[in-house]
């Protein structure tokens, strides 16, 4: 088994990810690993010599690049945050401030804008990833009522009110809590609170 | 070489606020990220957050969210760490640090004591 | 936020001898963890990156292993100025977390 430098007839390298051509000298050299770049090309004689990148700057694959990629911070005004930040060896991670999805993606999220808001009845169907995509606003299940505006409030169960000692004033529905009453207490016309005691 | 340099010991008392600085020299403010990290006494180190000084933007541990607030001054290349409604467990030596891998550079911290 | 165990929280050691603190995380930080000494009224000092890499100035007697969840740092021939206190940290998600700390002593 050959190691780098070595001659390559098929301008082909047995390790594509670790190896590239290299086509001056029609040789195999070895490229750098993460973290590292190219300080000196290879040679016939010689391979490639690596060096690790310099503070504030990345390299994320085996290369041969005579240069690393520089850090650089997530865009608050983009409405990305920092999970991560940048090493030698990857670029800073970001993802949407909470309450945002990302309206724009080239190889990775470059903008986020504001999740809609789900009305009265409604809540975001939740997903597998968060601010991956707008909000989906799906129907209360059953028995459940949600009373807001808002992209994050949920649906709660309607209040049982018998587990409070209470009787059933009115039903509750998808906007709204059921209305209790006390069970020796007419409920007057104008009440609409959501217990009486 | 890298510097940063912190005032001086402080002294506050229940729900006061602190604000310690942190002037650096020896490179470009504007492109590396500062930290602030605490250590109580008998305490682990805490990290607080970060500034970015080249867009002055900030990014807060959960835990201090609300109580801390991080700025920086490009002019001075000093940044600050005010903490507010400080409690006795708030007495601990803040330090800011410069990150690349870690923490290779500290300012030699700042001692805050709050007492009644 | 990932928990970082550093155990032992104490040893007694003697010149020249071999010292193993361990840092175990609590979920997968890949090579990300650094390691610092701390004498009292200092500023802790960075000693490893990267899980291995010794930062500049930082005698051979220091190295660091591990990646994942499980991580240590050896002093291989403990000299007199070595008796401090160490720490880890990782540095792979925010909010950064530290060990507790292991002291190192005089037997």
């Known amino acids: 088994q050959a190691v780098p430098p070595y001659a390559s007839e098929n301008q082909t390298c047995r390790d594509q990810e670790k190896e590239y051509y290299e086509p001056q000298h029609r040789i195999c050299c070895s490229r750098c690993p993460p973290g590292t770049y190219v300080s000196a090309k290879c040679s016939r004689i010689r391979d490639t010599v690596c060096a690790t990148c310099a503070e504030n700057s990345y390299n994320e694959h085996w290369n041969y690049l005579t240069i690393c990629q520089l850090c650089r911070p997530c865009d608050p005004v983009m409405g990305l945050e920092e999970i991560a930040p940048c090493t030698s060896k990857r670029k800073t991670q970001c993802r949407c401030q909470p309450g945002m999805f990302c309206a724009a993606w080239a190889l990775e999220c470059t903008h986020c804008e504001l999740l809609s808001d789900c009305p009265p009845g409604t809540e975001a169907e939740l997903k597998d990833e968060v601010g991956k995509g707008n909000n989906h606003c799906v129907p209360c299940k059953a028995g459940h009522f949600q009373n807001t505006s808002s992209p994050s409030a949920r649906c709660q169960p309607h209040t049982r009110c018998e587990n409070q000692g209470l009787v059933e004033a009115a039903p509750g529905t998808a906007q709204s809590d059921t209305t209790c009453k006390n069970p020796l207490e007419p409920l007057p016309p104008e009440m609409s609170g959501t217990m009486l005691m | 070489q890298v510097q940063l340099v912190q005032s001086g010991a402080e002294v506050k008392k229940p729900g006061q606020s602190v604000k310690v600085s942190c002037k650096a020299s020896g490179y470009t403010f504007t492109t590396y990220y500062l930290h602030w990290v605490r250590q109580a006494p008998g305490q682990c180190l805490e990290w607080m957050g970060w500034?970015?000084?080249?867009?002055?933007?900030?990014q807060y541990n959960e835990k201090f969210k609300g109580r801390v607030t991080i700025t920086a001054d490009k002019s001075t290349s000093t940044a600050y760490m005010e903490l507010s409604s400080l409690r006795s467990e708030d007495t601990a030596v803040y330090y800011c640090a410069r990150s690349w891998e870690g923490f290779p550079y500290w300012g030699q911290g700042t001692t805050v004591t709050v007492s009644s | 936020d990932i928990q970082m165990t550093q155990s032992p929280s104490s040893l007694s050691a003697s010149v020249g001898d071999r010292v193993t603190i361990t840092c175990k995380a609590s979920q997968n930080v890949g090579i990300n963890v650094a390691w610092y000494q701390q004498k009292p009224g200092k500023a802790p000092k960075l000693l490893i990156s990267?899980?291995?890499y010794r930062y500049s100035g930082v005698p051979s007697r220091f190295s660091g292993s591990g990646s994942g969840t499980d991580f240590t740092l050896t002093i291989s021939s403990l000299q007199p100025e070595d008796f401090a206190t160490y720490f880890c940290?990782?540095?792979?998600?925010?909010?950064?977390?530290f060990g507790c700390g292991t002291k190192v002593e005089i037997k």
């Open positions: 990267s899980a291995s």
């Open positions: 500034i970015y000084p080249g867009n002055v933007h900030a």
């Open positions: 940290q990782q540095y792979d998600t925010y909010p950064f977390t």
